[in-house]
Interface confidence: low
C-alpha cells in the first residue's frame, strides 16, 4: 500500500505519530475499537517526551492509553514490550483493586488528572487517545 | 551484556525437594519479570512460573502448581524456584528467562528425579 | 489454555534455500508471539518478539509476520549455523505456552 505521510485532518502530528485525542467517553474496549477503525490503536507510551507531549494535550482528565492485562500480564495494545518499557505509574499502582464494588479487578490503564498512570475497572467511560504511525502502509491492517 | 546463570540442579530422589537459583546481572534486575521453563529429555519447552519485578504478580502452570515455589531477591540480583515433591516427570533441564517474551535465557540447569 | 501448532514439524533444506514455518494458535493472541532457536545441547535463543520484532544482534535474514492466530517465520537464505529446532511461543495470556518445534536438518 501506499506510505502515509502526513496526519489526517484533526489529528496531531508528533515524531512521525500522528494523534488523535477524543472529547468524549467510551469504556476501554469501544475506545480500541475506534481506535482500530481508524486504522490506529490507542496510544502506547514508550518514552518520557512521549509521555509529556500527551500530557499537555489531554490535560487533568482520566484518559485511556493502550495498556491492558487483562489475560494476566500487562501488556501494549501494538506487541510493545511492556516490562522492559517505559512506565509511569502513580505511587501503589496498579493495584488490580477489587473495592470498588463493580466485580472484578482493574485492568485497563488510563492517565490520571497528573498524568501518571493507574489502573481502572475497564467499563469505566473516560477520554481516549488513538496514535498511528507515520511511513506505515496506510492499507495495513490496523495494529489489533 | 545481559547474562543469566542457573545452579542448584542435580539427582533427587522421588518426594524429594530441589531449590534452583538464577544470578542475573548486565541489567537492573528489579526491573524485569522473570520466568522458569523447563525442558525434558528429547522433548519441547514448557514454560513452569513467573514472577514480576516487585513479586506482586505470580503464575504457575498446573503440572507444577502447589509443589513449586518462585521467588526473587532484588537486593542479590537472584531468581529462585523451590522445587518439593518432586516426580520422575520433573526431570529436565531448567532454565530461568527474562520477560514474557523469553528475549534472554540462562545456560540451564539438570534436575533428575530418580530413584 | 492457549494451544500452539507448527508446521511442519520438520524439514530437510539446503544452503541458500528460503525457509517458511508456520505458527498457529488456537485463539487470537494479537502480536503476542516470539520465535527461539535452539541448538542441540544449548538453550533457546530469542529471534523475534511481537510476532515481528527482531532481537537485538539477530541477522535480518530472519523474519516473521503475522497477527492473530495465524504467524510465519521466514529465513531468506538459510546458512549453516541455521540447522536447527524453531519454536514459537505466545505471551497473550497464562500459562505461556510453545509450538512443538520444527527440527530444520540438512538435506
Known amino acids: 500500500g501506499s506510505e502515509r505521510t502526513c496526519c489526517p485532518v484533526n489529528w496531531v502530528e508528533h515524531e512521525r505519530s500522528c494523534y488523535w485525542f477524543s472529547r468524549s467517553g467510551k469504556a476501554w474496549a469501544d475506545a480500541d475499537n475506534y481506535c482500530r477503525l481508524e486504522d490506529a490503536h490507542l496510544v502506547v507510551v514508550t518514552s518520557w517526551e512521549e509521555q509529556k507531549f500527551v500530557q499537555h494535550h489531554i490535560g487533568p482528565v482520566n484518559t485511556w492509553m493502550g495498556l491492558h492485562d487483562q489475560n494476566g500480564p500487562w501488556k501494549w495494545v501494538d506487541g510493545t514490550d511492556y516490562e522492559t518499557g517505559f512506565k509511569n505509574w502513580r505511587p501503589e499502582q496498579p493495584d488490580d483493586w477489587y473495592g470498588h464494588g463493580l466485580g472484578g479487578g482493574e485492568d485497563c490503564a488510563h492517565f490520571t488528572d497528573d498524568g501518571r498512570w493507574n489502573d481502572d475497572v475497564c467499563q469505566r467511560p473516560y477520554r481516549w487517545v488513538c496514535e498511528t504511525e507515520l511511513d506505515k502502509a496506510s492499507q495495513e491492517p490496523p495494529l489489533l | 551484556e545481559v547474562q543469566l546463570v542457573e545452579s542448584g540442579g542435580g539427582l533427587v530422589k522421588p518426594g524429594g525437594s530441589l531449590r534452583l537459583s538464577c544470578a542475573a546481572s548486565?541489567?537492573?534486575?528489579?526491573?524485569?519479570?522473570m520466568n522458569w521453563v523447563r525442558q525434558g529429555p528429547g522433548k519441547g519447552l514448557e514454560w513452569i512460573s513467573s514472577?514480576?519485578?516487585?513479586?506482586?504478580?505470580?503464575y504457575y502452570a498446573d503440572s507444577v502448581k502447589g509443589r513449586f515455589t518462585i521467588s526473587r531477591d532484588n537486593a542479590k540480583n537472584s531468581l529462585y524456584l523451590q522445587m518439593n515433591s518432586l516426580r520422575a516427570e520433573d526431570t529436565a533441564v531448567y532454565y530461568c528467562?527474562?520477560?514474557?517474551?523469553?528475549?534472554?535465557w540462562g545456560q540451564g540447569t539438570l534436575v533428575t528425579v530418580s530413584s | 489454555d492457549i494451544q500452539m501448532t507448527q508446521s511442519p514439524s520438520s524439514l530437510s533444506a539446503s544452503v541458500g534455500d528460503r525457509v517458511t514455518i508456520t505458527c498457529r494458535a488456537s485463539?487470537?493472541?494479537?502480536?503476542?508471539l516470539a520465535w527461539f532457536q535452539q541448538k542441540p545441547g544449548k538453550a533457546p535463543q530469542s529471534l523475534m518478539s511481537?510476532?515481528?520484532g527482531l532481537q537485538s544482534g539477530v541477522p535480518s535474514k530472519f523474519s516473521g509476520s503475522g497477527s492473530g492466530t495465524d504467524f510465519t517465520l521466514t529465513i531468506s537464505s538459510l546458512q549453516p549455523e541455521d540447522f536447527a529446532t524453531y519454536y514459537c511461543?505466545?505471551?497473550?495470556?497464562?500459562?505461556?505456552?510453545f509450538g512443538p518445534g520444527t527440527k530444520v536438518d540438512i538435506k
Open positions: 511481537a510476532a515481528s
Open positions: 548486565g541489567f537492573t534486575f528489579s526491573n524485569y519479570r
Open positions: 511461543q505466545q505471551y497473550q495470556n497464562y500459562p505461556f505456552t
Open positions: 528467562a527474562r520477560v514474557a517474551s523469553f528475549d534472554y
Open positions: 514472577i514480576s519485578g516487585s513479586s506482586t504478580d505470580i
Open positions: 485463539q487470537g493472541i494479537s502480536h503476542y
